[in-house]
Interface confidence: low
């Protein structure tokens, strides 16, 4: 199944997807779609990138804020909205038939978050999904189990990712 | 040497079905992905389904999406090609070709399929 | 769809002389990471199955005689027989492996004149 990332609505949600170039410089085509990668390419394509460079992107909310030159090719949705809930394909397009990277990773949209939940609500959450807080462009700086779950509130936890990183409030679930 | 033999080819009425099957020899089967590909009498060549080397992934062109479906049995170093709904267009000579994954093929003689009432 | 294009569609041509067949793809089949174009030329008499001559463009498969050739790069690319023999006489295919749905240009029959 789908990693999934949580992000709260106006907020910008980050899907991490990255690859290799070997050599360093020698770039190959990416496109990012929305729904499950198909047999071919990407359906419903939101942003394509060629040898180059992005070429192709549906909104402007939709970039690659990463070291797209080194392989970075994360996607950035702006502001998103509850309709950006779904999943999402990142195909790195080698050449040879059988040789495509395909990464389908879930994004949920919250609404935001109002009011502290109550304990057994965080504690269904929690169980339902073990959550590793990404704090950068890098990966998780900490790795969080539901027994090891500090006693914080979403709120918290939203407020938290906002000042560590700008890009939003962004959380995967393994 | 490869040797590709494709089996399994004859007449069929619309839509009937056909298995196809390619025994391989001469190399590490297991090793390379596998794929057929299609002539219609007097007519090009038309790509029909790939397999990758642990069977994981298997692609077919639109034109047999949903009808046709690629295996393989890696054991037995044998290729197969399950044929459903037969139209009179996938009338044919099917060749099996190795790999397509990252260099060109090398193909068996090809059995003939031939779809009519 | 990466479709190819092949011309002419026939070609005639005298024993000893030379024999030039285009291809050409609608995007580039040349991945630059191993500086390879991921294109095949076959070589298709009646009643047999495809046979390969060239592969990434310009290496020769074993045993291929060498009046045959292969050029070109991203595009555009050619099969020469450099002097054709009776043998030869045949329909030649390109096909590019570069990307799903292999595609295959429509042949060119190439006999004597």
């Known amino acids: 199944s789908e990693v999934e990332y949580i992000a709260e609505v106006g907020q910008n949600a980050y899907l991490p997807c990255s690859y290799t170039p070997a050599p360093p410089g020698n770039l190959v085509p990416v496109c990012w779609g929305k729904g499950a990668c198909p047999v071919f390419d990407c359906s419903n394509v939101v942003l394509r990138t060629d040898n180059r460079d992005v070429n192709d992107r549906t909104s402007g909310r939709y970039w690659l804020k990463g070291d797209f030159h080194k392989g970075d090719v994360s996607l950035t949705i702006e502001n998103v909205t509850l309709a950006d809930s779904g999943v999402y394909c990142c195909r790195i397009q080698i050449p040879g038939i059988m040789n495509d990277e395909k990464h389908n990773v879930k994004l949920v949209v919250i609404k935001p978050a109002k009011v502290t939940p109550a304990p057994t609500l965080q504690r269904d959450l929690t169980s339902a999904f073990p959550r590793m807080l990404t704090t950068g462009e890098h990966g998780p700086a900490e790795t969080q189990t539901p027994g090891s779950l500090p006693d914080v509130n979403l709120t918290q936890i939203f407020t938290l990712t906002n000042e560590l990183r700008d890009s939003g409030a962004t959380i995967r679930t393994a | 040497e490869v040797q590709l033999l494709e089996a399994g080819g004859g007449p069929v009425q619309p839509g009937g079905s056909l298995r196809l099957s390619c025994a391989a020899a001469?190399?590490?089967?297991?090793?390379?992905?596998m794929s057929w590909v299609r002539q219609a009498p007097g007519k090009g060549l038309e790509w029909v389904s790939s397999?990758?080397?642990?069977?994981?992934?298997?692609y077919h062109a639109d034109s047999v999406q949903g009808r046709f479906t690629i295996s393989r049995d890696n054991s037995k170093s044998t290729l197969y090609l399950q044929m459903n709904s037969l139209r009179a267009e996938d009338t044919a000579v099917y060749y099996c070709?190795?790999?397509?994954?990252?260099?060109?093929?090398?193909w068996g003689q090809g059995t003939l399929v031939t779809v009519s009432s | 769809d990466i479709v190819m294009t092949q011309s002419p569609d026939s070609l005639a041509v005298s024993l000893g002389e030379r024999a030039t067949i285009n291809c050409k793809s609608s995007?580039?089949?040349?991945?630059?990471?191993?500086?390879?174009?991921?294109l095949a030329w076959y070589q298709q008499k009646p009643g047999q199955p495809p046979k390969l001559l060239i592969y990434?463009?310009?290496t020769r498969e074993s045993g291929v005689p060498d009046r045959f050739s292969g050029s070109g790069s991203g595009t555009d690319f050619t099969l020469t027989i450099s002097s054709l023999q009776a043998e030869d006489v045949a329909v030649y295919y390109c096909?590019?492996?570069?990307?799903?749905?292999?595609?295959f240009g429509g042949g060119t029959k190439v006999e004597i004149k």
């Open positions: 070709a190795k790999d397509f994954g990252d260099s060109p093929g090398y």
């Open positions: 001469g190399f590490t089967f297991s090793n390379y992905a």
């Open positions: 397999i990758s080397d642990n069977g994981g992934t298997a």
């Open positions: 995007q580039s089949v040349l991945y630059s990471f191993k500086n390879k174009n991921y």
């Open positions: 990434w463009a310009s």
């Open positions: 096909q590019q492996y570069y990307s799903s749905p292999l595609t």
